[in-house]
Amino acid sequence: MNGSEYFVKIQSFLGGAPTEDLKALSQQNVSMDLATFMKLRTDAVLPLTVAEVQKLLGPHVEGLKAEERHRPVRDWILRQRQDDLDTLGLGLQGGIPNGYLVLDLSMQEALSGTPCLLGP
């Protein structure tokens, strides 16, 4: 069974998938469609890297631009380095500026909804 066939079989169960499962899926050439991606749990999507999202979505990554103001894409963008977002070639804006340090302060983030940044 190839990645696409596997994805069709598990698609209906993906809404509640944890980050670990999404990371594993990104290695299997599944080409998840945008509609499915938009239904994923925000907390599961946030830890994914740009490279992992690109692999997870395949050609569907082109659809991120039209969804950049909607969750979970909007919140995911805020967590990525702008340099990494630029590699997607879609003009996605709102990432962490180059030269900033991201502190993983879970309590701060839980309260504010955004990561804590230290300037250069």
Epitope: D33, L34, Q54, P59, H60, E62, G63, K65, A66, D86, T87, L88, G89, L90, G91
Partner: antibody
Framework: EVQLVQSGAEVKKPGASVKVSCKAS????????MHWVRQAPGQGLEWMGN????????YYNERFRSRVTMTVDKSTSTVYMELSSLRSEDTAVYYC??????????????WGQGTTVTVSS | DIQMTQSPSSLSASVGDRVTITCKAS??????IAWYQHKPGKAPKLLIH???ELQPGVPSRFSGSGSGRDYTFTISSLQPEDIATYYC?????????FGGGTKVEIK
């Protein structure tokens, strides 16, 4: 003003390869993927694939996957489409097209002027 | 991939006539359809996107409608300059597909 300027007409022999260029200007080149569409005589428009201008990653129509190569030169804001093992059925006008990402995956709002490729022995 | 079945493949109508072209998608495309006018030796020209949104500068005689799998493109009053081939494009999927085209001629 957005402009997509393509290379000139080509005449090739069967079995040869052709490389068509598309130079973009008037917008941030790395903010939009570039697509290639062709039209053979008496046929409709056919989507061939696209390329991410930032990292050079392409996605191809399955029909052309074994014969097409799309590349990018960021320094000159130019994308290239190379088609190999040419046959007479590849005689067509080849267009580059830029999408507008207003909704979903984007429709094409800007097109190159087209490059005529003739395959003949 | 999503297939787009366009009909008719050609039509002949008189100036002033109402012309209708249809495109049927192989699956629901959520209104993500665009319509193009293509004249010989020219690049395709975008007329309509998202089923019914008219591009700036495009005459109001052109219109579009539909939902789900079925879509319609209409020229309310055919003009001599409308002689061209018209194509639908689905962009609900990143692997874009066009309809087969409709060649419009004047009687």
């Amino acid at each position: 003003e957005v402009q997509l300027v393509q290379s000139g007409a080509e005449v090739k022999k069967p079995g040869a390869s052709v490389k068509v260029s598309c130079k973009a200007s008037g917008y941030t080149f790395t903010n939009y993927w570039m697509h290639w569409v062709r039209q053979a005589p008496g046929q409709g428009l056919e989507w061939m694939g696209n390329i991410n201008p930032s990292n050079g990653g392409p996605y191809y129509n399955e029909r052309f996957r074994s014969r097409v190569t799309m590349t990018v030169d960021k320094s000159t804001s130019t994308v290239y489409m190379e088609l190999s093992s040419l046959r007479s059925e590849d005689t067509a006008v080849y267009y580059c097209a830029r999408p507008y990402y207003g909704s979903s995956y984007g429709y094409f709002d800007y097109w190159g002027q087209g490059t005529t490729v003739t395959v003949s022995s | 991939d999503i297939q787009m079945t366009q009909s008719p493949s050609s039509l002949s109508a008189s100036v002033g006539d109402r012309v209708t072209i249809t495109c049927k998608a192989s699956q629901d495309i959520n209104k993500y359809i665009a319509w193009y006018q293509h004249k010989p030796g020219k690049a395709p020209k975008l007329l309509i996107h998202y089923t019914s949104e008219l591009q700036p500068g495009v005459p109001s005689r052109f219109s579009g409608s539909g939902s789900g799998r079925d879509y319609t493109f209409t020229i309310s009053s055919l003009q001599p300059e409308d002689i061209a081939t018209y194509y639908c494009l689905q962009y609900a999927n990143p692997l874009r597909t066009f309809g087969g085209g409709t060649k419009v001629e004047i009687k």
